[in-house]
């Protein structure tokens, strides 16, 4: 019986060029976490396995960093990074839990409004 729940940061926003931490937390279960997959729709970002460690997808290796913990740090954000991200927790003996995070990457407010606040 699966009693656990996944807590996520929910809907988050970040500035273009910045970085963001994607974080999920599994609670209300004593199940052992054996692997966490981080995925976008149809795209694997990274895997953290209790025995094998981390695998970062080559497509993201320049801008994805493992951690903190089982989370994932996404760097050098672009507007194309806007979308759904999923943390998939493989656990024993419960099975699989999935959490969802929606990330919106916004145009930099400095770039957008900087010209208005120039000192003469």
């Amino acid at each position: 019986m699966m009693t656990g729940t996944i807590e996520t940061t929910g809907n988050i926003s970040a500035e273009k060029g910045g970085s963001i931490i994607l974080q999920c937390h599994l609670s209300s279960t004593t199940a052992q976490v054996t692997q966490v997959n981080w995925e976008q729709q149809d795209q694997l970002l990274a895997i953290c396995n209790a025995d094998l460690g981390w695998h970062i997808s080559p497509s993201f290796k320049d801008r994805v960093a493992p951690g903190p913990g089982l989370g994932l740090t996404l760097q050098s954000l672009t507007v194309n990074d806007t979308g759904e991200y999923f943390c998939i927790y493989h656990t024993y003996p419960d099975g699989t839990y999935t959490g969802r995070i929606f990330l919106e990457v916004l145009e930099s407010s400095v770039a957008e409004h900087g010209a208005r606040f120039q000192i003469p």
Epitope: Q32, T34, Q35, D42, Q43, L44, I47, N49, A50, D51, L52, H55, S57, S59, H90, Y92, P93, T96
Partner: antibody, heavy 121, light 110 residues
């Protein structure tokens, strides 16, 4: 170097039993899930059974076509995977491969050469 | 009848681009990563593409994979005679709680 060597295949009559073995070497056997995949003559690949690694409790999985008839097991002290097959039928005739699974729900990165099981009267 | 549907055959002339499709459902391809295996005549299968679109070392970059929803495809750009083989897609099926393979596609290089 990772190596998987299947054995135990042969010719049996319908209704008989057979036990296949897969001897593994070159990696930390207990860490990895292991699978059996079969291929009937001239046909495609069919996953038969799998067993998870130690951290996932050596959980077993079966295809519907063999559940209740086949039993997968492993002996981590001997680095060996087993497939006990009972009540064999003609349609179980195939080459049986063992394969290592890397990551959970991951890829089968190493395969043995296979062992042929023929069920015939 | 395989859970994953592949065309039984595909063909191309040397240098041509060939694509092999793999169609499934939400419980398999829709929710899980896809893998492609190559089986040369008389040999054991070999991993060709993993995690939807990654290539193991030693696999030529003319092979590429993609996945969208409940479908996946394997592309071979500039097919060569040594690519003549059977190709299988595979994924986990949440409903069946097990691995599923496509029926396989026999690639002929003309």
């Amino acid at each position: 170097d990772v190596q998987l060597v299947e054995s135990g295949g042969g010719v049996v009559r319908p209704g008989e039993s057979l036990r296949l073995s897969c001897a593994a070497s070159g990696f930390n056997f207990s860490t990895y899930a292991m699978n059996w995949v079969r291929q009937a003559p001239g046909e495609g690949l069919e996953w038969v059974s799998g067993i998870s690694g130690r951290s996932s409790g050596d959980t077993t999985y079966y295809a519907d076509s063999v559940r209740g008839w086949f039993t997968v097991s492993r002996d981590n002290s001997k680095n060996t995977l087993y497939l006990q097959m009972s009540s064999l039928r003609a349609e179980d005739t195939a080459v049986y491969y063992c394969a290592r699974e890397t990551w959970i729900r991951g890829y089968f990165d190493y395969w043995g050469l296979g062992t042929l099981v023929t069920v015939s009267s | 009848q395989s859970v994953l549907t592949q065309p039984p055959s595909a063909s191309g002339t040397p240098g041509q681009r060939v694509t092999i499709s793999c169609s499934g459902s939400r419980s398999n391809l829709g929710n899980n990563l896809v893998y492609w295996y190559q089986q040369l005549p008389g040999t054991a299968p070999k991993l060709l593409i993993y995690f939807n679109n990654e290539r193991p070392s030693g696999v030529p970059d003319r092979f590429s994979g993609s996945k969208s929803g409940t479908s996946a495809s394997l592309a071979i750009s500039g097919v060569q005679s040594e690519d003549e083989a059977d190709y299988y897609c595979a994924t986990w099926d949440d409903s069946l709680n097990g691995w599923v393979f496509g029926g396989g596609t026999k690639l002929t290089v003309l």
